[in-house]
Every structure is written in C-alpha cells, then in structure tokens.
C-alpha cells in the first residue's frame, strides 16, 4: 500500500527557518503534490504549494521555495512569520496524486522538543486520507 511521510524541520543555521519534507512511498508516477497547512487540502487547510513534475511549482506566502528533492519527494522552505514561536503546533499536510493509485495524504508537525538540525530521518506517517 502506498504511504506518505511528512517531516517538519527547524534549520540549524537559522532558528526562524523551517522546512517541510514530504515523500511518497509506493509504485506509480506522481502527477501532482499539494502542500497545505492548518489542515488537509480542501478540508480546512490553506494551500502553501503545488508541485507538478513537468509544469513546475506554485507557492503561496509564507512559502519561500518549493522544490523536488527526488522523483518522489519534495521540500518546502518557509519564511519566518515573526511570531514568537513560528510554526510551532502547526499542522502541515502533503497530498500526492499518483497514477494509477489515486491521491494519498498525510500530515505532520514540528516535534515538541526539536533540536535544530537533529530531526530523525523521515519515517512513514499513518495515512490520513486516500481519495
């Protein structure tokens, strides 16, 4: 069964800089990736980025740079919101649309006791929704 993993990481060099990493574990080719925060895409979340393998990427503030890391994983850098604890307790969701499997989505947030740059390697997260 395909799985989606989500990892939120605070950068060691800039404590106010955060990166969301997402990946798809499964067969098939990815046709679109959507990253949202505050909830799943289309279910209370606000879109941060859309990545298409051929047509490019689209990003919304406070996203700074969305990019493909591999053919099945992406990263999204976020600007500092200016809040005292930016992005803490915030849920980030990634939805991968793949052919022929359909859409798979999972969410994650910054671990409560995050040491900058010392996040654990990405591990699969339970799938929240499969369309």
């Amino acid at each position: 069964t395909p799985e989606v993993w989500v990892q939120v990481q605070m950068e060691a060099t800039e404590l106010s800089s955060f990166t969301v990493h997402c990946g798809f574990l499964g067969p098939g080719s990815i046709s679109l990736v959507t990253v949202s925060w505050g909830g799943p895409d289309g279910a209370g979340g606000t879109k941060l980025a859309v990545l298409h393998p051929e047509l490019g990427t689209r990003q919304w503030a406070p996203a700074r740079q969305a990019r493909w890391e591999t053919q099945s994983s992406i990263s999204l850098a976020l600007e500092d919101s200016g809040a005292s604890s930016p992005f803490a307790n915030t849920t980030f969701c990634c939805k991968f649309a793949s052919f022929p499997e359909g859409s798979w989505e999972s969410c994650g947030s910054l671990p409560p006791s995050s040491d900058p740059g010392l996040s654990a390697p990405p591990t699969p997260v339970p799938i929240l929704r499969a369309d």
Epitope: G38, L55, W60, A61, A63, S81, P86
Partner: antibody
Framework: EVQLQQSGAELVKPGASVKLSCTAS????????IHWVKRRPEQGLEWIGG????????LYASKFQDMATITADTSSSTAYMQLSSLTSGDTAVYYC????????????????WGQGTSVTVSS | DIVLTQSPASLVVSLGQRATISCRAS??????????MHWYQQKPGQPPKLLIY???NLESGVPARFSGSGSGTDFTLNIHPVEAEDAATYYC?????????FGGGTNLEIK
C-alpha cells in the same frame, strides 16, 4: 504596465449561455492565478472561481460549480469564463482579476482587475 | 463558508479625521502568525483596488494613510488622515480556505 482587458457588454436571454474573455498584458499569465468575481447591482462581491493557466487547475465556489466553466489559452494570454443556463439573478458585472505575485510567490489577494463586463439577462 | 461581517455599513468622516472599518470573520483566518485577510477600495464604475494584503501589508502605490491590523477573527482598516478621494466602498476578503469570501462592504462618505 500590467493590464487585464475584458470583453464588451452582453445582453442575453434567460437559459442562454455567454462566454466572457480577459486578455492579460504586461505580465506572464502563467505566473499566477486568474480569478473571476461577480458584482450584482446594489450588492457586494462574490468569488466565482479561478484558474492556474500554467497547470490548468481550476477552482470554483460550489454555488457556481454547475454554471461556470473557466478556461485559459496561454498562447494568447487570455482567460475565459463561460456562464450557462443564465437567469435574471445572473445580471451583474463580472470582473477578472490577477492574484498578487511577487518574486515567484503568490499572496491570495487580487492586485490587478479588469474593467468588468456587464451581463444583462433579459427576455 | 467563512462569513465576513463588516461594520459599520456606512460611515461619514470629516476631512483629515480617522476612518475605522471593522471586519469580523465567523472563524479564524490566521495560521501561525499569518492572517489571510485583505482589503479593497471600490469607487463607482471602477473595479476594486487592492489596498492591504495579509492583514497589514500595504500594497505598492497605496498611500501610507491606509493601514490594516488584526488577527484571528477581528480585523481593522484605518484611514488617517482621510482625504476627499477616499470616498468609496471598502471590502474585506479572506483567503483562509475555499471559497474566499468578501465582506458586505462599508460605504465611506467624506464631509
């Protein structure tokens, strides 16, 4: 200079369809979303839907899902909105608008608007 | 859908004074320090004009007498000092989720 030029006023009969156009200049239509907004006489603004011309992705308000079809032709930098099964309640000014884009990032707000197309539905 | 309620519906302000327009959302439109609320000005026969984006950011070319503030569900547009050319209808708009919705508008009259 960024501009959105909309097609001229339309007078249509109830039940008919109309296709409005919005031609962009001064920017690359593929760099942003194009939205459509309705304004009825003496009423406020209503978002109908939008399109990402680069990806072809469309979004609609559920209220307009069945009657509005938004498309775009990147070769002519033009977005279109077709409205079908028109009723008197669809008499309004329809605006196209560009989503604010700066340094490859979008901001959800609409920073440039067309002059509006007046649609009158009357028998 | 998120409902935006603007108040007052109409406002009369003397030249040089402060105009304050409020917009209340039926649920929070903020996430982690970012507020997805925008303000527009519309004059008769013209399309809307973006004034403020993301609650407090002044759009390029808009005079500094316009300012926006707020977070969560309560937002404010301030105009100070008001000038004669500011007579218009003002709308708030959220983009926290689909569909984006607009407030009912506030008609500002200058005396």
């Amino acid at each position: 200079e960024v501009q959105l030029q909309q097609s001229g006023a339309e007078l249509v009969k109830p039940g008919a369809s109309v296709k409005l156009s919005c031609t962009a200049s001064g920017f690359n239509i593929e760099d942003t979303y194009i939205h459509w907004v309705k304004r009825r006489p003496e009423q406020g603004l209503e978002w109908i839907g939008g399109i990402d011309p680069a990806i072809g992705n469309t979004l609609y308000a559920s209220k307009f899902q069945d009657m509005a079809t938004i498309t775009a032709d990147t070769s002519s930098s033009t977005a279109y909105m077709q409205l079908s099964s028109l009723t008197s309640g669809d008499t309004a000014v329809y605006y196209c608008a560009r989503e604010r884009v700066y340094s490859n990032t979008l901001y959800y707000a609409m920073d440039y608007w067309g002059q509006g197309t007046s649609v009158t539905v009357s028998s | 859908d998120i409902v935006l309620t603007q108040s007052p519906a109409s406002l009369v302000v003397s030249l040089g004074q402060r105009a304050t327009i409020s917009c209340r959302a039926s649920k929070s439109v903020s996430i982690s320090g970012y507020s997805y609320m925008h303000w527009y000005q519309q004059k008769p026969g013209q399309p809307p004009k973006l004034l403020i984006y993301l609650a407090s950011n002044l759009e390029s070319g808009v005079p500094a007498r316009f300012s926006g503030s707020g977070s969560g569900t309560d937002f404010t547009l301030n105009i100070h000092p008001v000038e004669a050319e500011d007579a218009a209808t003002y709308y708030c708009q959220h983009s926290r989720e689909l569909p984006p919705t607009f407030g009912g508008g506030t008609n500002l009259e200058i005396k």
